[in-house]
Interface confidence: low
């Protein structure tokens, strides 16, 4: 009678995580007499799986009655795939022996690999804005994927990016894998409207890849241009001066009038007008008595926005003869004046 | 050590097709991408193509669309360009170039060249 | 396409020089900036990248600057050596572009 065979028909077996593999083995002969066991590995750091003759194995259930006479399909299920279920599999013969069996014949095994989808993308920005034409570094992570094999693409506005680097890690085999990814992003004024997109393809993802956002709004500051100019005025003796902020972003913005280097007035920015491309327009204005100065009067319109260093722009009111001989009370009145985006 | 060899020059008459080839050897060739640059006598270097080594997919410059065709054979660590129909101004060296990344990045700068094949079309 | 353009074709220069080469972006690029020495019947070799990195072996001597639209491979020391023609190139966006070289001649 021939000796017995051992055979494992699929060289491999690919299974998503969460599903139950099956992996197939069958003898060719009833004797000798012993049990089978699986394992995944081979070696003295072995794994036992499954075993016939005794042991629980809550994962593990068998294709085929192995009690019931003449069987010689030893097949099994395994429920519940995770990554770390892979490996290769060996079911194996034992011959039944005292004190203990023996092992007889091994198949030639079954490599399980998991597929195991990547996380969702995870986006994040600079820890500090910079501004336009600065360049800013968007880093992108996925993790828990197998196999390795996997695309990363990043995209601004729908433009694909092409400065960027990625890892894949562990560089070796692994039950499952992370990626991470840096895009470098030149920044331009439009960009506060503006969106990188990290986007991830794999074989688990049946061809909708997954994709992670981060809002160029976070990383970009467009600072302020300041245009201080003086309003007519029908009272001769009052003069109306104005302080047009313009195109800045993020919202944060302080503003102090200074006369002849002396601070007069500070408010903060609140009712503002939202420019098309997202960045905002402010006014502020001081109302002079010009009968109060004698001498012409340098007006400070000075900005501090976003927390940076001051800006400021000066405007010299003349103050005429006449005015100088006649001297009174100077009066300040402050303003919220919308304006048109520019 | 890290070798991009490319296969030797090539005589054709316009309208006949051209195969040369990019044999990556030193490291493992499904790890980085690989480009093709053309540089036509005496100018300066284009680039025509990005070939994901991983995928087989590649990102075309819209002038080498149509008559240019890119392969791989991942088994043989082969990068393939093939000309259809040549014309006159196909007349150049054309390099292959390894990415500087490890797996998956799009191309960048580049490190690795071969050596060149000079494709003449002459009538 | 981002166009590259080296305005000089060809510069004239003697041994011990301080050379200069500019390269000029046709929209910002950010840093995204790579330069190149080749040599007649030879493959480009890289030199610098991301602007300002000297690559691994390259001499001291050869720097790279800029960042935006602007950018310049500077030569400290011209040695014989570095007679050759230079190309920038970008790799901020499809397609990826070369300026059309800088030639270094002896004067």
């Known amino acids: 009678e021939d000796e017995l065979q051992v055979i494992q028909p699929e060289k491999s077996v690919s299974v998503a995580a969460g599903e139950s593999a099956t992996l197939r083995c069958a003898m060719t002969s009833l004797i000798p007499v012993g049990p089978i066991m699986w394992f995944r590995g081979a070696g003295a750091g072995r794994e036992l799986i499954y075993n016939q003759k005794e042991g629980h194995f809550p994962r593990v259930t068998t294709v085929s009655e192995l009690t019931k006479r003449n069987n010689l399909d030893f097949s099994i299920s395994i429920s519940n795939i995770t990554p770390a279920d892979a490996g290769t599999y060996y079911c194996v013969k034992f011959r039944k022996g005292s004190p203990d069996d023996v092992e007889f014949k091994s198949g030639a095994g079954t490599e399980l690999s998991v597929r195991a989808k990547p996380s969702a993308p995870v986006v994040s920005g600079p820890a500090v804005r910079a501004t336009p034409e600065h360049t800013v570094s968007f880093t992108c992570e996925s993790h828990g994927f197998s196999p390795r094999d996997i695309t990363l693409k990043w995209f601004k506005n729908g433009n694909e990016l092409s400065d960027f680097q990625t890892n894949v890690d562990p560089a070796g085999d692994s039950v499952s894998y992370s990626i991470h990814s840096t895009a470098r992003v030149v920044l331009t004024r439009g960009d506060v409207h503006s969106q990188v997109i990290c986007e991830i393809a794999h074989i688990t993802l049946q061809g909708d890849p997954l994709r992670g956002t981060a809002n160029l709004s976070e990383a970009i500051r467009v600072p302020p241009t300041l245009e201080v100019t003086q309003q007519p005025m029908r009272a001769e003796n009052q003069a109306n001066v104005t302080c047009q902020v313009s195109n800045f972003y993020p919202r944060g913005l302080q503003l102090t009038w200074l006369e002849n280097g002396n601070v007069s007035r500070t408010e903060t920015a609140s009712t503002l007008i939202e420019n098309k491309d997202g960045t905002y327009n402010w006014m502020s204005w001081l109302l002079v008595n010009t009968c109060a100065h004698r001498d012409d009067v340098v007006l400070t319109c000075q900005v501090e926005h976003d927390g940076q260093q001051a800006v400021s722009k000066s405007y010299a009111l003349e103050i005429s003869a006449h005015q100088k001989e006649h001297g009174s009370d100077i009066t300040h009145e402050a303003a919220l004046a919308p304006t048109a985006p520019l | 050590q890290i070798q991009l060899v490319q296969s030797g020059p090539e005589l054709k008459k316009p309208g006949e097709t051209v195969k040369i080839s990019c044999k990556a050897s030193?490291?493992?060739?499904?790890?980085?991408?690989m480009s093709w640059v053309k540089q036509a006598p005496g100018k300066g270097l284009k680039w025509m193509v990005w070939?994901?080594?991983?995928?087989?997919?590649?990102t075309y410059a819209d002038d080498f669309k149509g008559r240019f065709a890119f392969s791989l054979e991942t088994s043989a660590s082969t990068s393939y360009l093939q000309i259809n129909n040549l014309k006159n101004e196909d007349t150049a060296t054309y390099f292959c170039a390894r990415d500087p990344h490890y797996y998956g990045s799009s191309p960048a700068w580049f490190v690795y060249w071969g050596q060149g094949t000079l494709v003449t079309v002459s009538a | 396409d981002i166009v590259m353009t080296q305005s000089q074709k060809f510069m004239s220069t003697t041994i011990g020089d301080r050379v200069s080469i500019t390269c000029e972006a046709s929209q910002i690029v950010g840093i995204a900036v790579a330069w190149y020495q080749q040599k007649p019947g030879q493959s480009p070799k890289l030199l610098i990248y991301?602007?300002?990195n000297r690559y691994t072996g390259v001499p001291d001597r050869f720097t790279g600057s800029g960042s935006g639209t602007d950018f310049t491979l500077t030569i400290s020391n011209m040695q014989s050596e570095d007679l050759a023609n230079y190309f920038c190139?970008?790799?901020?966006?499809?397609?990826?572009?070369f300026g059309s070289g800088t030639k270094l001649e002896v004067k």
């Open positions: 030193g490291y493992t060739f499904t790890t980085y991408g």
């Open positions: 190139q970008q790799y901020s966006a499809y397609p990826f572009t």
């Open positions: 070939i994901n080594t991983y995928s087989g997919v590649p």
């Open positions: 991301s602007a300002s």
